[in-house]
């Protein structure tokens, strides 16, 4: 946005935040055993030009970020996403209250980048 | 920004919007010399609670989906973001003027999702 | 033809608000985003913001961010623009203006005066 | 921002002369310039766009050059209907900029 640009106040960059999910916050303490909650992690902050290696950009990204320069209106800046994710075990009831173990993919922010 | 959480109209969900990039309009029309520009495409709209089928959510994204409807303020929602990407050729210049056909991966969105 | 009309002139006090509004005809308002740009006396035009009529997103220039609101109704072909806070500098015309994408300014409103005194 | 900067700030001329104003920007805008002609309590009107491009109805008259930082309009031929304020516009990068203004004025 123009007050990216023009802005005293610096937006932080395209970076991981901490966060830890509680399943009871979630209302699925219920059915989930274990864990209680886990660090799930997320991704915020901007990605402006220039992005810089720490963004772990795409080729497409930076082409986006070029575009948006020019036509903030009708392009977005790339949007700062997950690159890498790690799986976790949980530890559950089925729907016929079998205790089951299973591996959940993509649960867990390990690394951000523009996208 | 504070009217895209605000706002009581709807917003398109996440998908791939048609974009037409010019190599001239970003100032590369010296050095790359095919094509004259390509169709990169790019990701935008919401990815809001329930996220559905078409959105190609991860898992992670869900559970910040329900984290970001209880704290919105703290944790953003998942942005819209490439989920497949295509390469293309382009021939250009190098450094020392020789003609070099170089293939760029991820340069082409071809499908969006909330991550 | 493309023509945008413009609310009528509008004398406030220092310290209130003024929306005017810019009627858009002869194109498709939503494939255009609508910028205002505004001009005090004997200055040089100075940008204040834009909405992207298909969505709604907004962007301020720095200089008036937290006082200028823009908006638009879709079914009306129309874009609003709000500004609070008044004070004598913001004492001006004030235009809206359709941008193309890759384009500068092509269509511009006729122009509203805004005075504010006491 | 970048700052866009135009030379004279007023000029005097007649009718049939030709005439050139400049507008220097302060950082690269490749050809991502714009010309204006505004008359009083009117808006402004588009005359050149991509630093030469004529806009459609524009007499040929006008036209523009440049490219990088340095730009020029250009009447070849100065008629009664073109003493007005003439404005640049840089849309090269976010946030858009104007020149501060030539008026054009009969000599």
């Known amino acids: 946005s123009a007050s990216d640009y023009n802005s005293s106040e610096l937006k932080t960059a395209c970076r991981k935040h901490e966060l830890y999910v509680s399943f009871q916050d979630l209302g699925w303490q219920d059915w989930i055993i274990a864990p209680k909650g886990y660090a799930a992690n997320y991704c915020d902050g901007e990605c402006s030009f220039p992005l810089n290696a720490h963004m772990n950009a795409t080729n497409h990204a930076i082409v986006q970020t070029l575009v948006h320069l020019m036509n903030p209106e009708y392009v977005p800046k790339p949007c700062c996403a997950p690159t890498k994710l790690n799986a976790i075990s949980v530890l559950y009831f089925d729907d016929n209250s079998n205790v089951i173990l299973k591996k959940y993919r993509n649960m867990v922010v390990r690394a951000c980048g523009c996208h | 920004s504070a009217s895209d959480y605000n706002s009581s109209e709807l917003k398109t969900a996440c998908r791939k919007h048609e974009l037409y990039v010019s190599f001239q309009d970003l100032g590369w029309q010296d050095w790359i010399i095919a094509p004259k520009g390509y169709a990169a495409n790019y990701c935008d709209g919401e990815c809001s609670f329930p996220l559905n089928a078409h959105m190609n959510a991860t898992n992670h994204a869900i559970v910040q989906t329900l984290v970001h409807l209880m704290n919105p303020e703290y944790v953003p929602k998942p942005c819209c973001a490439p989920t497949k990407l295509n390469a293309i050729s382009v021939l250009y210049f190098d450094d020392n003027s020789n003609v070099i056909l170089k293939k760029y991966r991820n340069m082409v969105v071809r499908a969006c999702g909330c991550h | 033809q493309v023509q945008f009309v413009q609310s009528g002139a509008e004398v406030k006090k220092p310290g209130a608000s003024v929306k005017v509004s810019c009627k858009a005809s002869?194109?498709?308002?939503?494939?255009?985003?609508m910028h205002w740009v505004r001009q005090a006396p004997g200055q040089r035009l100075e940008w204040m913001g834009w909405?992207?009529?298909?969505?709604?997103?907004?962007d301020y220039s720095q200089n008036f961010q937290g006082r200028v609101t823009i908006t638009r109704d879709t079914y009306a072909n129309t874009v609003y623009m709000e500004l609070s806070s008044l004070r004598s500098e913001d004492t001006a015309v004030y235009y809206c203006?359709?941008?193309?994408?890759?384009?500068?300014?092509?269509?511009w409103g006729q122009g509203t005066l805004v005075t504010v005194s006491s | 921002d970048i700052q866009m900067t135009q030379s004279p700030s007023t000029l005097s001329a007649s009718v049939g002369d030709r005439v050139t104003i400049t507008c220097r920007a302060s950082?690269?805008?490749?050809?991502?310039l714009a010309w204006y002609q505004q008359k009083p309590g009117k808006a402004p009107k588009l005359l050149i766009y991509?630093?030469?491009s004529l806009e459609s109805g524009v007499p040929s008259r006008f036209s523009g050059s440049g490219s990088g930082t340095e730009f020029t309009l250009t009447i070849s031929s100065l008629q009664p209907d073109d003493f007005a304020t003439y404005y640049c516009?840089?849309?090269?990068?976010?946030?858009?900029?104007f020149g501060q203004g030539t008026k054009v004025e009969i000599k």
């Open positions: 203006a359709r941008r193309p994408y890759g384009g500068p300014f092509d269509y």
């Open positions: 002869g194109y498709t308002f939503t494939s255009h985003a």
């Open positions: 909405i992207n009529a298909a969505n709604g997103k907004t």
């Open positions: 950082q690269s805008i490749s050809i991502w």
């Open positions: 991509k630093a030469s």
């Open positions: 516009q840089q849309y090269n990068l976010y946030p858009w900029t």
